[in-house]
Interface confidence: low
Amino acid sequence: MAGTVRTACLVVAMLLSLDFPGQAQPPPPPPDATCHQVRSFFQRLQPGLKWVPETPVPGSDLQVCLPKGPTCCSRKMEEKYQLTARLNMEQLLQSASMELKFLIIQNAAVFQEAFEIVVRHAKNYTNAMFKNNYPSLTPQAFEFVGEFFTDVSLYILGSDINVDDMVNELFDSLFPVIYTQLMNPGLPDSALDINECLRGARRDLKVFGNFPKLIMTQVSKSLQVTRIFLQALNLGIEVINTTDHLKFSKDCGRMLTRMWYCSYCQGLMMVKPCGGYCNVVMQGCMAGVVEIDKYWREYILSLEELVNGMYRIYDMENVLLGLFSTIHDSIQYVQKNAGKLTTTIGKLCAHSQQRQYRSAYYPEDLFIDKKVLKVAHVEHEETLSSRRRELIQKLKSFISFYSALPGYICSHSPVAENDTLCWNGQELVERYSQKAARNGMKNQFNLHELKMKGPEPVVSQIIDKLKHINQLLRTMSMPKGRVLDKNLDEEGFESGDCGDDEDECIGGSGDGMIKVKNQLRFLAELAYDLDVDDAPGNSQQATPKDNEISTFHNLGNVHSPLKLLTSMAISVVCFFFLVH
């Protein structure tokens, strides 16, 4: 049957342009005394005519399209109309949310992959720093760096890993290698069992100064924000999916049937529902869904606040891509204090000092290749930061999505212009009056009662999840104009600041060492996947006609109306056909 309906849709699509050129229709002919028109319409909807009366009947068994006189509908037809009306409604809802859904799904996938790539680049930069500046550390350093960045990836994706532990593990692992390879390269093999002691001494003696704490602060803050950003996008998908697949109630089905199909029972094939009446019905049907609106608005605004705060130490791209430089600075700090450290560790870890091991602290410029990592510095390169802001701007065009849904669906289904000569659910009227319509409908359904039922359990659940994520987003959002919070001010430095002790200065990166300033060259591997305008059905040029159709600015982004139109085409054409 579905195949037949689909085929019929395509055939009738051509007829539609003749039936509905968009101008006001002439007054409809009197009801068909033989139900012929109703039979031919219903034949397209449901092959076989056994349910359609040959001539008008009393219709005493009808429950929805209550007749004022003889009717061309039977109870079975009414049931079919109800089913079709609910399916049409579900299709319209899915079409309405398609662009928004794709926007979030695409971005969630893209940002997840992009963050993985940032992590990979950060790892490569850090490895390159070791290879160029400390070749004797490379085999082990590569391993520790790899483990650290694997943990970073897992943390972003929600693993229960403590960031401080990750950073501590990195420095705990690095120090024994630095000590035995750089500071005491002549250390005999018998002394190499001191690694555990060195790991402990690393913390007790603060051998890397304030750098581990600085990295902990920056990494934990930037990764927390990144993680919540991804969680929020994934919840956005869940919200749309939930409302996308709502099953409308029987009450709603009856209201929709009255609006879209009951006119046929009277042989009024060309008449359209009154616009005001459509709005009343849609608000009734979507009362539960519209309750999401308040939390959806808050979600987008909270996400915007989060994104606005994602800079400097709250931007993982900036933090991770600059990590190689901070690690390099931390090793230089160890080397500056090599003499003092060697003596202290010699006493603490009690390895035999039978001969004086030469200290391997060399002048900084001997270690630094002036060309190293110049490739990392890319001017005017598009960053994830700009992509995030772009996403927020697009999302903000959907801020009224839920409150605007009833109006949107009415504007995308056939309704009479100016509420003149239209169907009000009971009869053809010259002009629609909401009060008269409500009075006339009292016996048929209680619209107020339908609204008062409250949202479905799935909607309530998604509202709870939105409340939770909104709270998290608010907690994470940074106060404007402040980058560092109280904790960092009290316990550490921001990169570029210096303490009283010159040794604690976390400033420059050494001659020729070039810091990466929030620049990630996406090149071939990422650029295309970040282009969220490449939505299904998107065409690069929209015709004026397309723009006229997609005029509902409050509901969604209309930069590229063909995106929505193409995806809606089949369902809406079928819907037009099935309704009128």
């Epitope: 799904i105 695409q106 996938a109 992959e113 993985e116 790539i117 992590v119 990979r120 790892k123 490569n124 790899g146 694997t150 990836s153 897992l154 994706l157 090149l523 071939a524 591997e525 990422l526 650029a527 295309y528 996947d529 282009d531 490449d534 939505a535 299904p536 059905g537 998107n538 065409s539 690069q540």
Partner: antibody
Framework: DVQLQESGPGLVKPSQSLSLTCTVT?????????WNWIRQFPGNKLEWMAY???????SYNPSLKSRISITRDTAKNQFFLQLNSVTTEDSATYYC?????????WGAGTTVTVSS | QIVLTQSPAIMSASLGEEITLTCSAS?????MHWYQQKSGTSPKLLIY???ILASGVPSRFSGSGSGTFYSLTISSVEAEDAADYYC????????FGGGTKLEIK
Amino acid sequence: DVQLQESGPGLVKPSQSLSLTCTVTGYSITSDSAWNWIRQFPGNKLEWMAYIMYSGITSYNPSLKSRISITRDTAKNQFFLQLNSVTTEDSATYYCSRGYWYFDVWGAGTTVTVSS
Amino acid sequence: QIVLTQSPAIMSASLGEEITLTCSASSSVSYMHWYQQKSGTSPKLLIYSTSILASGVPSRFSGSGSGTFYSLTISSVEAEDAADYYCLQWITYRTFGGGTKLEIK
């Protein structure tokens, strides 16, 4: 030089599970990139099935998601495919490959026939 | 799911001839990758990110395109180019085209 080699049974009975192994040499599967399974049906149609990223994150083709699993053994530098409830439609040449956005290195492939 | 349609399904070319294989996407994609598969071997990366030649690929191969239409051009066909050619995209997950078989006359 990185090399990938697939291994597994050539013949599987319908409704049983298919298990394949990809052994990687010359490159650590935890260093970077993604490690994929792709199959090619007798008519030469190619289908991406799944990947496991260097960090352990997995992704599956939605059409197979309910019956597919990809895992790895980092110590042996191997990754694995398990496809449950196979039918004759799953008869194909199965390839493992490396790559995120595209696949730059492929194994030679292993042919699997599903038949009773 | 994005569907990639390659045309023609089979192409016959003479040595030295310039030919173009096309790949059409059901929805807009931003990049396309191309593979060559010779009989009895696994696919080999030919071009990635629409137009970048993979390592060791002769310069007679080139790629171009945008949106929903992409092409692979061989400027002067050689006997060793007889093979199946596939396009690949990834937006939400990866899909391959149905392939074009290139035969040499």
